[in-house]
């Protein structure tokens, strides 16, 4: 059976750039070990944003540089990206595979469109 | 530019061993899958086996599973494919591939390199 | 295993046709499929990833859609660089499996 991951369709990003949504999949095996990868779709180019594997139970730990955190919660994985700003508007695809053991499985979501304001810089007071 | 350049095929007894080694340049391969896909003489692609470079984890098709041991040292930027117990039906045209991010797509192959399993 | 069956094994057409291929998954799978073209002594070139993505490059003549698990590649009008063996690919879930190839070739 194929892979289903949803995720939300539009996500407005805070005023401090920071953007979370859920990526949800149904895991057509009994994975132990997870990846999760987001991904940023533009112009037809494709990019990594961050990805982390985990095992099932265990908290999603992504690299200490990454712009990502996340949690994650039987099949569910809560992701938050940071430090967003407005050319950082564009589609973030969630990539699910499960990786171990055998046989692996993908999953790709439709991707989430996620809007980036800048603030408006605050007027100078004298 | 990416590149992937095959080597180490040749003519080989059955039941012997070849390693193939797959040198990839032009991007940081730690980030990528790389893939062993094969074509015999006149027929169709087939899928032998695929690495995770980030982390090893490995894949097989059942017609090489437990003879064939994919590798990967990401220090070199090259991926291997040992082959033993090799059988006349491994003869073929072996291509090492790179997985794309997205739908894990072959986006670069390497020119191929061929291997011939005879007596 | 999924099986990905692909229709037809070969065709002949003359420059600026229309072709379709036709591959047809043996049970569900995910939008990871994709299409590579290959030309005699060559690699495969990938065309299509994602069942309907157009792969940097190529001209957009090449088209992919999905419909279930049937997954379609179209040439809009053939040119005489195209004629060449055409192979569908899934990715959904190890072992990755291709079709067995539509030769095209010149009417």
């Known amino acids: 059976k194929a892979m289903h991951v949803a995720q939300p369709a539009v996500v407005l990003a805070s005023s401090r750039g920071i953007a979370s949504f859920v990526c949800e999949y149904a895991s057509p095996g009994k994975a132990t070990e997870v990846r999760v990868t987001v991904l940023r779709q533009a112009d037809s180019q494709v990019t990594e944003v961050c990805a982390a594997t985990y095992m099932m139970g265990n908290e999603l730990t992504f690299l200490d540089d990454s712009i990502c955190t996340g949690t994650s919660s039987g099949n569910q994985v809560n992701l938050t990206i940071q430090g967003l700003r407005a050319m950082d508007t564009g589609l973030y695809i969630c990539k699910v595979e499960l990786m171990y053991p055998p046989p692996y499985y993908l999953g790709i979501g439709n991707g989430t469109q996620i809007y980036v304001i800048d603030p408006e810089p605050c007027p100078d007071s004298d | 530019e990416v590149q992937l350049v095959e080597s180490g095929g040749g003519l080989v007894q059955p039941g012997g061993s070849l390693r193939l080694s797959c040198a990839a340049s032009g991007f940081t391969f730690s980030g990528y899958w790389i893939h062993w896909v094969r074509q015999a003489p006149g027929k169709g692609l087939e899928w032998v086996a695929a690495?995770?470079?980030?982390?090893?984890?490995?894949y097989y098709a059942d017609s090489v599973k437990g003879r064939f041991t994919i590798s990967a040292d990401t220090s070199k930027n090259t991926a291997y494919l040992q082959m033993n117990s090799l059988r006349a039906e491994d003869t073929a045209v072996y291509y090492c591939?790179?997985?794309?991010?997205?739908?894990?797509?072959?986006?670069?192959w390497g020119q191929g390199t061929l291997v011939t399993v005879s007596s | 295993d999924i099986q990905m069956t692909q229709s037809p094994s070969s065709l002949s057409a003359s420059v600026g046709d229309r072709v379709t291929i036709t591959c047809r998954a043996s049970q569900s799978v995910s939008s990871a499929v994709a299409w590579y073209q290959q030309k005699p002594g060559k690699a495969p070139k990938l065309l299509i990833y994602?069942?309907?993505s157009l792969y940097s490059g190529v001209p957009s003549r090449f088209s992919g859609s999905r419909s279930g698990t049937d997954f379609t590649l179209t040439i809009s009008s053939l040119q005489p660089e195209d004629f060449a063996t055409y192979y569908c690919q899934q990715s959904s879930t190890t072992p990755f499996t291709f079709g067995q190839g539509t030769k095209v070739e010149i009417k």
């Open positions: 690495i995770t470079s980030r982390d090893s984890y490995t």
């Open positions: 591939a790179r997985g794309s991010y997205l739908g894990s797509a072959f986006d670069y």
């Open positions: 994602s069942a309907s």
